[in-house]
């Protein structure tokens, strides 16, 4: 079972001093969202017992395995159900504490009732403040039964629940009719999933015989030991004031565990600590009683004395729960209550015994859960004991369970059961994850989900180039850290696999699935420099650059041009995808802007050093487009263009530029300047006959303006081919006169 304890401090004179603490003895408990599991949760559960809203409770984490709830302002804050949740994955466990008001009308004789499937459970509510009215019983907040107030027996209202089944488990309450729910008696009923002494899916397995009030868990057959006891069968008492599965926790305060209620995972429930009893766990056990809630009786023999925390303390020469066994009877010594081995290992198990007559090798045997008896292969005989060594055949999962070492001599016999846990070495369910890559190294997150059992003691990362038959390289890493694989080849695929190990011999699991991780290209090292640039318009810039000459092939896939507009805080990036390119036209720039310009060589995703930057000023934007452009063929080699000046000019036009292009032609267009800005007409000469041309034009002030609409016109007739278009301008009026 999960090592989880919910402690309730029951000093109820002052609710503000009341606190609940949840303590986990699990490895790595409560660390949060790392690979080792979720944190401890401690909260009030208002689903069944609703109390008036108050200020929120304060949750304080004390280290990684303890959480405390405080901030109770009035007694009604305490009434109800509290729960602590701890453990990870399938081991996630909820521990529940039910708090009753000491001033309630009805009080439970016993809060927690753990019963077996098929038993009859009897809940008893003691009358504390009498009301001559009906008593309403509820189960998990819903109506369950009514008792007439005349049905009280010896001042108690009893609810009999015959033949209980696991679904009957839950919170029960007894309340006087139409009285405040805070005056109720609250109970917790835990119904084990099996009959007495049985556990397992079909209840076919036999419980180990839990001692000292321990309760056999119906799922795993383990004993959930009362606070203050430990061991596979709860056979060992902790020192006073200690609790936890290994007695590792200490009760807070100078009065030890006085005034504390301990709640443990089901099917145990809650009780006082060992040596204490009473509704507030403040009364010491009466003479002759010991253990949690003082439920156990000592009945010591042969001069043994009763200790209220541990039971019988035997005089020299005697041992046993009641000091009933003479030391002359053989006795198993110092047998661990629990051993852990990995699947398919062949461990050696030692079992030591003493007694009179002295045990010899043949008198000590080891019995497996399936009844197989192993005889020792060798024995070490010392003056005070004999230690038999057993070589265990290859372990299988079915070997998990309770083993028994037994010694028999003519003086009698003794046996000691111990639990063997056969653990499955962990096997990764997924491949490791690539975090970052460079040309010669890969950074990998190795810890993945796995099948089998933890904890993970070591992580091995195996890697080699893809499709290689060479030996795998291996690196052993800390489970919680990322791994850097170094000294790799650039631009190479590597097959990477994880192998996990758990503690102990044979704890190495099978390798996990492979994944392909590819190193990056080598970084480009050449630094380009900018040869020059010229403005081809208010928003166009042509840039050229060079690279230093070096022997060997060029390491690079292309160039990245960067334009930084410092005024607006904007960067423009232009990708030139040919490593042979040495020039680029940048368009769509912002007119009238200062740019800082540089160029870098890139290879894969890596950038080389940037060129020294250049500073470029684009001219401001030009004037609007000329209006109503019109073309009229005059001859087989001449076409006249007419237009109207642009509107809303920001200044005087310095010239017009006409663009001439053969319709459907593949060649570059021809630009012709009209240097007399007052003109609104021009004749383009030297054209080819019977040829369709496209024309558009724009004005220039400080910079070139927007293009006009494009017009089409064909030259006339079938004349000779001209040498190429030229232009003649005149004022529109003059053209009309002609």
């Amino acid at each position: 079972a999960v090592d989880l304890t919910l402690l309730a401090n029951l000093r109820l004179t002052d609710p503000q001093r009341f606190f609940l603490t949840c303590v986990s003895g699990e490895a790595g408990a409560g660390r949060g969202s790392d690979a080792w599991g979720p944190p401890l949760l401690l909260e009030k559960d208002d689903r069944i017992v609703r109390t008036p809203p108050g200020p929120p409770l304060r949750l304080a984490r004390n280290g990684s395995h303890q959480v405390t709830l405080r901030g109770f302002s009035k007694p009604s804050d305490l009434v109800g159900v509290f729960s602590c949740v701890g453990g990870a994955g399938a081991r996630r466990t909820r521990v529940i504490y039910v708090h009753n008001s000491p001033g309630a009308h009805l009080l439970p004789d016993k809060v927690t009732h753990t019963v077996n499937k098929g038993d009859t459970a009897v809940l008893s509510a003691r009358v504390h403040k009498e009301k001559q009215t009906d008593v309403i019983w509820k189960s998990n907040g819903s109506y369950f039964y009514t008792l007439d107030w005349h049905e009280a027996q010896d001042g108690r209202f009893l609810l009999q629940l015959p033949n209980v089944q696991p679904p009957s488990s839950g919170i029960y309450s007894a309340t006087y009719l139409e009285a405040s729910p805070l005056g109720s008696a609250f109970f917790r009923l835990i119904v084990r999933g099996c009959g007495a002494g049985r556990w397992g899916p079909g209840c076919t397995k036999e419980c180990p015989g839990c001692l000292h009030g321990g309760v056999c868990h119906d799922h795993d057959g383990e004993c959930v030991c009362p606070p203050g006891f430990t061991g596979t069968r709860c056979e060992q008492a902790c020192r006073e004031g200690r609790f936890g599965q290994s007695c590792q926790e200490q009760c807070p305060g100078i009065s030890g565990c006085r005034g504390l209620t301990f709640c443990l995972p089901d099917p145990y429930g809650c009780s006082c600590g060992s040596g204490w009893r009473g509704s507030q766990c403040q009364e010491a056990c009466a003479p002759g009683h010991f253990g949690a809630d003082c439920r156990l009786q000592c009945q010591c023999q042969n001069g043994g004395t009763c200790d209220r925390f541990s039971g019988c303390v035997c005089p020299s020469g005697w041992h046993g729960v009641h000091c009933e066994k003479s030391d002359r009877i053989p006795q198993i010594l110092n047998m661990a209550s629990e051993l852990e081995f990995n699947l398919e290992t062949m461990p050696r198990i030692n079992c030591a015994a003493a007694g009179n007559p002295f045990p010899v090798r043949g008198s000590i045997e080891l019995r497996k859960p399936d009844g197989t008896v192993l005889l020792s292969t060798k024995a070490i005989v010392e003056p005070e004991k004999t230690t038999a060594e057993f070589e265990v055949p290859r372990l299988v999962l079915a070997d998990s369970g309770f083993w028994e070492c037994r010694v028999s001599t003519s003086g009698g016999q003794d046996s000691r059961r111990f639990k063997v846990n056969v653990k499955v070495p962990p096997v990764p369910l997924a491949a490791p994850r690539l975090l970052t890559k460079q040309s010669r190294q890969l950074v990998v997150s190795p810890l993945v989900s796995f099948s089998g059992d933890g904890p993970i003691s070591t992580v091995r990362l195996h890697y080699r180039p893809q499709d290689s038959t060479m030996d795998w390289s291996t690196i052993v890493v800390d489970p919680s850290e990322n791994v850097t694989l170094m000294n790799l080849r650039p631009k190479t695929g590597y097959s990477v696999r994880v192998q996990l190990s758990r503690p102990g011999e044979g704890g190495e699991g099978a390798w996990g699935p492979p994944t392909l991780m590819t190193t990056d290209c080598p970084e480009p090292l050449l630094q380009p420099w900018l040869e020059g640039w010229h403005v081809e318009g208010t928003d166009r810039l042509r840039v050229s650059w060079s690279l230093p000459l070096v022997p060997g092939p060029l390491v690079g896939d292309g160039f990245l041009l960067r334009l930084w507009d410092g005024t607006r805080g904007q960067e423009r990036r232009e990708n030139v995808s040919s490593p042979q390119a040495r020039t680029a036209l940048l368009t769509g720039l912002t007119p009238g802007t200062h740019y800082q310009l540089d160029v870098q060589l890139y290879h894969c995703t890596l950038l080389g050093p940037a060129s020294p930057p250049a500073h470029v000023l684009l001219p401001p934007s030009g004037p609007p487009a000329p209006r109503h452009l019109h073309a009229q063929a005059l001859s087989d080699s001449e076409i006249q263009l007419t237009w109207k000046h642009p509107e809303a000019l920001p200044g005087p036009i310095s010239k017009y530029v006409v663009e001439v292009q053969v319709a459907g032609g593949a060649g570059d267009p021809l630009w012709i300047d009209v240097d007399r800005p007052e003109e609104t007409s021009t004749i383009i000469r030297g054209l080819n006959a019977s040829t369709r041309y496209l024309f558009r034009m724009r004005a220039s002030i400080q910079g070139l303006g927007d293009w006009s609409n494009t017009v089409e016109e064909s030259t006339l007739g079938n004349g000779l081919q001209a040498e190429g278009p030229v232009q003649e301008s005149r004022a529109a009026e003059e053209g009309l006169d002609q």
Epitope: T133, D134, I136, Y143, F144, T146, L147, E151, E178
Partner: antibody, heavy 118, light 108 residues
């Protein structure tokens, strides 16, 4: 679905007897306190009698004490009201009702009419 | 024994708010329950424990209780709300259930 179905009503002469039944379904009958409530024609509701789950404890209104007997058979999920020495003022619709977890009636039957007349 | 007093009738226009009272000595110290009984039908619990509504009862029905008067309030009254309404308490002195005389609600 909780259902309560009364039967056994009818015309009876003063001084006569009648036994009403209430068949319950849709809930665990043996856990609930059950009641009879009546309503005279054109009048309000009047509580008549109640019985606890075990059947061992009963309650009666003063107007019927000594004449009416409430009982139940948990194995048959049925509530009964044995009415003796009937009077004209016992003429009413008799309702069977279930008590909830408070002092209220959360489910009622449709009622059965008892007429006491010569 | 408790005596519960209700007005014989209350009339409101549809869409308005109806308030039905139930008077009794220190009724605020008891839990009051309200039932609706439409003509020719069995009573139906509409409010219990002063102010709680069973599932299926519209939010238009609400209750309150203090001093010597408990109140059933029906907002946005509909024609379908026309019925007799009874208050009820449990008399802890006699262990009897006590009903008020009933109030007929009419939607004008």
């Amino acid at each position: 679905e909780v259902q309560l179905l009364e039967s056994g009503g009818g015309l009876v002469q003063p001084g006569g007897s009648l036994r009403l039944s209430c068949a319950a379904s849709g809930f665990t009958f043996s856990r609930y306190v059950m009641f009879w409530v009546r309503q005279a024609p054109g009048k309000g509701l009047e509580w008549v009698s109640g019985i606890y789950p075990s059947g061992g404890h009963t309650r009666y209104a003063d107007s019927v004490k000594g004449r009416f007997t409430i009982s139940r058979d948990n194995s048959k999920n049925t509530l009964y009201l044995q009415m003796n020495s009937l009077r004209a003022e016992d003429t009413a619709v008799y309702y069977c009702a279930r008590r909830g977890s408070g002092g209220y009636f959360d489910y009622w039957g449709q009622g059965t009419l008892v007429t006491v007349s010569s | 024994q408790s005596e519960l007093t209700q007005p014989p009738s209350v009339s409101v226009a549809p869409g308005q708010t109806a308030v039905i009272t139930c008077g009794g000595s220190n009724i605020g110290g008891k839990s009051v329950h309200w039932y609706q009984q439409k003509s020719g039908q069995a009573p139906v619990l509409v409010v219990f424990d002063d102010r709680d509504r069973p599932s299926g009862i519209p939010e238009r029905f609400s209750g309150s209780n203090s001093g010597n008067t408990a109140t059933l309030t029906i907002t946005r009254v509909e024609v379908g709300d026309e019925a007799d309404y009874y208050c009820q308490v449990w008399d802890s002195g006699t262990d009897h259930r006590v009903f008020g005389g009933g109030t007929r609600l009419t939607a004008l």
